[in-house]
Interface confidence: low
């Protein structure tokens, strides 16, 4: 049928398809209207009446044009290691991202199931590879002539200061101590501090229930620091 005269519901031409934002209802055998984002199908269409849409209830949403009988439940509230970067609305799910200093240890479709704290390199070890949204910090022992005296997820091994006269030689976890004044510092530009990675992974992408009316639950997975590896905290 020409678009100008086809009002839903209508029977499609043999072998034809329904238009954009319409769907074919198998029961009515008609092209019927989809519901817009933020709504769902309260009453399905018949041969003589179109789809009746209704707004999604609190804590539920639909992101696309649809004909679902119930809106999807927004994901659970963000866990303590995450921040909410997108609120639950009738048209979009809540998005949780790992907070600074954390990374997504267990990812899932379009999101993060589990945030974990970035490993901290203990004294004597420095950051070999900084953490990212989805990977932990890698620590390495400080090489001769370098040291790290901090427990940090961002500090790299720094060169010992160069003394005119050395009072105490430096080691992997301690800088050299000079007897003379005005020691010189041998340091590569920008070698001291790596910026904290910014996490942008989302958490619950799936709907999560809401009672009495909507569906249920959430996964606030317990999160702890990674087990100590060589070069991590926990001597």
């Amino acid at each position: 049928l020409p678009a100008q005269v086809a009002f839903t519901p209508y029977a499609p031409e043999p072998g034809g398809t329904c238009r954009l934002r319409e769907y074919y209802d198998q029961t009515a055998q008609m092209c019927c209207s989809k519901c817009p984002p933020g709504q769902h199908a309260k009453v399905f269409c018949t041969k003589t009446s179109d789809t009746v849409c209704d707004s999604c209830e609190d804590s539920t949403y639909t992101q696309l044009w649809n004909w679902v009988p119930e809106c999807l439940s927004c994901g659970s509230r963000c866990s303590s290691d995450q921040v909410e970067t997108q609120a639950c609305t009738r048209e979009q799910n809540r998005i949780c991202t790992c907070r600074p200093g954390w990374y997504c240890a267990l990812s899932k479709q379009e999101g993060c199931r589990l945030c974990a704290q970035l490993r901290k390199c203990r004294p004597g070890f420095g950051v070999a590879r900084p953490g990212t949204e989805t990977s932990d910090v890698v620590c390495k022992p400080c090489a001769p002539g370098t040291f790290s005296n901090t427990t940090s997820s961002t500090d790299i091994c720094r060169p010992h200061q160069i003394c005119h006269v050395v009072a105490i030689p430096g080691n992997a976890s301690m800088d050299a101590v000079c007897t003379s004044t005005s020691p010189t510092r041998s340091m590569a530009p920008g070698a001291v501090h790596l910026p904290q990675p910014v996490s942008t992974r989302s958490q619950h992408t799936q709907p999560t229930p809401a009672p009495s009316t909507a569906p249920g639950t959430s996964f606030l997975l317990p999160v702890g620091p990674s087990p100590p590896a060589e070069g991590s905290t926990g001597d």
């Epitope: 609190d58 804590s59 009988p69 119930e70 999807l72 439940s73 659970s76 509230r77 866990s79 303590s80 899932k108 479709q109 199931r113 992408t205 799936q206 709907p207 999560t208 229930p209 809401a210 009672p211 009495s212 909507a214 569906p215 249920g216 639950t217 959430s218 996964f219 606030l220 997975l221 317990p222």
Partner: antibody, heavy 121, light 111 residues
Amino acid sequence: EVQLQQSGTVLARPGASVKMSCKTSGYTFTSYWMHWVKQRPGQGLEWIGTIYPGNSDTSYNQKFKGKAKLTAVTSASTAYMELNSLTNEDSAVFYCTRENLLLRSYFFDYWGQGTTLTVSS
Amino acid sequence: DIVMTQSPASLAVSLGQRATISCKASQSVDYDGDSYLNWYQQKPGQPPKLLIYAASNLPSGIPARFSGSGSGTDFTLNIHPVEEEDAATYYCQQSNEDPRTFGGGTKLEIK
């Protein structure tokens, strides 16, 4: 009316695997998390894990990782739990329970009648 | 994991009197001003039944003689006046984080 119907009593040998079911009706199966809870004879309740049938998302109690596997068949509105490498410690009643999320609360509002598992040689 | 400790493990209360059950969490189960703490009743041979959610809310169909209170780590279930049919084991449960954990249960006997 919401109903969760669990499969019947199971007797199994140590080392074997069993798969129990939880058939649901009266609500949209894919919209609610389904949890599984263990109760040993005369003991309290222990949370095993949960599955979201809408996308098969799962979360497990660390204690049951490798022991329990949760699955769901949406076309049958049925959740399943498979337990492997059975020992006497696995003898218990296992409940499936639907969790509801109110805007500011989560709770188990409907429970199956329980499946009794006895592990014995 | 959040450990939920209930006390007493059992108690006997006369018909018409008050039963008080305590539940303590090893860490706060509150979030943004709400308590993620539920109470369930279980009778022998039956699955648990939701009694109270969010510390103090009664689902429809639960008699008003059941009440819950508390926040943070300390919660209380009160039953008053106790009736014969209240003989059961009562469990508290936190839903603030996974793994969900239950208290050890309190067995209530009616004298």
